[in-house]
Amino acid sequence: ELCDDDPPKITHATFKAVAYKEGTMLNCECKRGFRRIKSGSPYMLCTGNSSHSSWDNQCQCTSSAARNTTKQVTPQPEEQKERKTTEMQSQMQLADQVSLPGHCREPPPWENEATERIYHFVVGQTVYYQCVQGYRALHRGPAESVCKMTHGKTRWTQPQLICTGETEPSQFPGEEEPQASPDGLPESETSR
């Protein structure tokens, strides 16, 4: 069941999931100057059975100048840098990530995708928070949020994290010692 809203926003922090539960949607969003092709789903879907899950549908972006072509343009230097980082993270994750039954890995990037990924999470999903560069984490408890169903309504638990204006970014699960990883899972790509 889909969570009614997005995970809580924490000032100076971003969140990501380690793995995505079946039923999760990832919007096919394109960077400026590109748009989703007119045939094909508006989102990718984590789908599968108890033994194997994968992303159904593929996102494709086309130049919004040339409406009916899938012509690609050369990314600008900053876009190349972004994409390179994303590709590297994706390759690392594909090589390292342990499969969780009923979960999908972070989907690999598609050409000319938007810089921010928009997910529609399902009940039971956990996301993990990290302070952005230049801010330090003060933990009052777990820096995570879980989408829960209560009395027929969904809600996200409040992450116990405050980010203060100091150096040293905090870690997501899997970025410190291996044993700090929940369920032994290594990292996946930033979703926000």
Partner: antibody, heavy 114, light 107 residues
Framework: QIQLQQSGAELVRPGTSVKMSCKAA????????IGWVKQRPGHGLEWIGD????????NYNEKFKGKATLTADTSSSTAYMQLSSLTSEDSAIYYC???????WGQGTPVTVSS | DIVLTQSQKFMSTSVGDRVSVTCKAS??????VAWYQQKPGQSPKALIY???YRYSGVPDRFTGSGSGTDFTLTISNVQSEDLAEYFC?????????FGGGTKLEIK
């Protein structure tokens, strides 16, 4: 709490235009497409088009090109649909919808009558 | 445009029964189909996305199935509050299209 609040009922003359609004609350307006759907008794539901408030992109059903114009104002998290050259065929309830059709406004009834 | 056909405009059932509403697409739409419930005087309410996934708050007596061109919404243990019209929708390609609707009547 995610909500799509639509403007009230409209009674308009044939040949004129009408502009209705859809105010979004409870989510990041610029992240999600807003779609518009027409419903007439005996005609079911018809998809008019959609707009991405963040990028300003629009898609239209060919049937409604020239009839409907979709816009969005990110500062007020409001999407708009203008219908022009109105005829009795445009009398209907118009719904806005967002987040992959998960959420729907309450509908704006439009009556075209002289 | 992709045409969605809901061949039964009306279906009559009794409380506690099981009923299946069908939807046929004129071409392959994968699993890019949603189902909506509309009660008289209300907006459509999303029940199912991607052919078989329930939205939050939707009772588990509503089940979606199918892929390609044939889709089914099954309501098991029908309740009086299920009196409504049910629409299927494809969003596999523009323009998105809806089925003509099936009205569920409770005997």
């Amino acid at each position: 709490q995610i909500q799509l609040q639509q403007s009230g009922a409209e009674l308009v003359r044939p040949g004129t235009s009408v502009k209705m609004s859809c105010k979004a609350a409870g989510y990041t307006f610029t992240n999600y497409w807003i779609g518009w759907v027409k419903q007439r008794p005996g005609h079911g539901l018809e998809w008019i088009g959609d707009i991405h408030p963040g990028g300003g992109y629009t898609n239209y059903n060919e049937k409604f090109k020239g009839k409907a114009t979709l816009t969005a104002d990110t500062s007020s998290s409001t999407a708009y649909m203008q219908l022009s050259s109105l005829t009795s065929e445009d009398s209907a309830i118009y719904y806005c919808t967002s987040r992959n059709f998960a959420y729907w406004g309450q509908g704006t009834p439009v009556t075209v009558s002289s | 445009d992709i045409v969605l056909t809901q061949s039964q405009k009306f279906m009559s059932t009794s409380v506690g029964d099981r009923v299946s509403v069908t939807c046929k697409a004129s071409q392959n739409v994968g699993t890019n189909v949603a189902w909506y419930q509309q009660k008289p005087g209300q907006s459509p309410k999303a029940l199912i996305y991607s052919a078989s996934y329930r939205y939050s708050g939707v009772p588990d007596r509503f089940t979606g199935s199918g892929s390609g061109t044939d889709f089914t919404l099954t309501i098991s243990n029908v309740q009086s509050e299920d009196l409504a019209e049910y629409f299927c929708q494809q969003y596999n390609s523009y323009p998105y299209t809806f089925g003509g609707g099936t009205k569920l009547e409770i005997k």
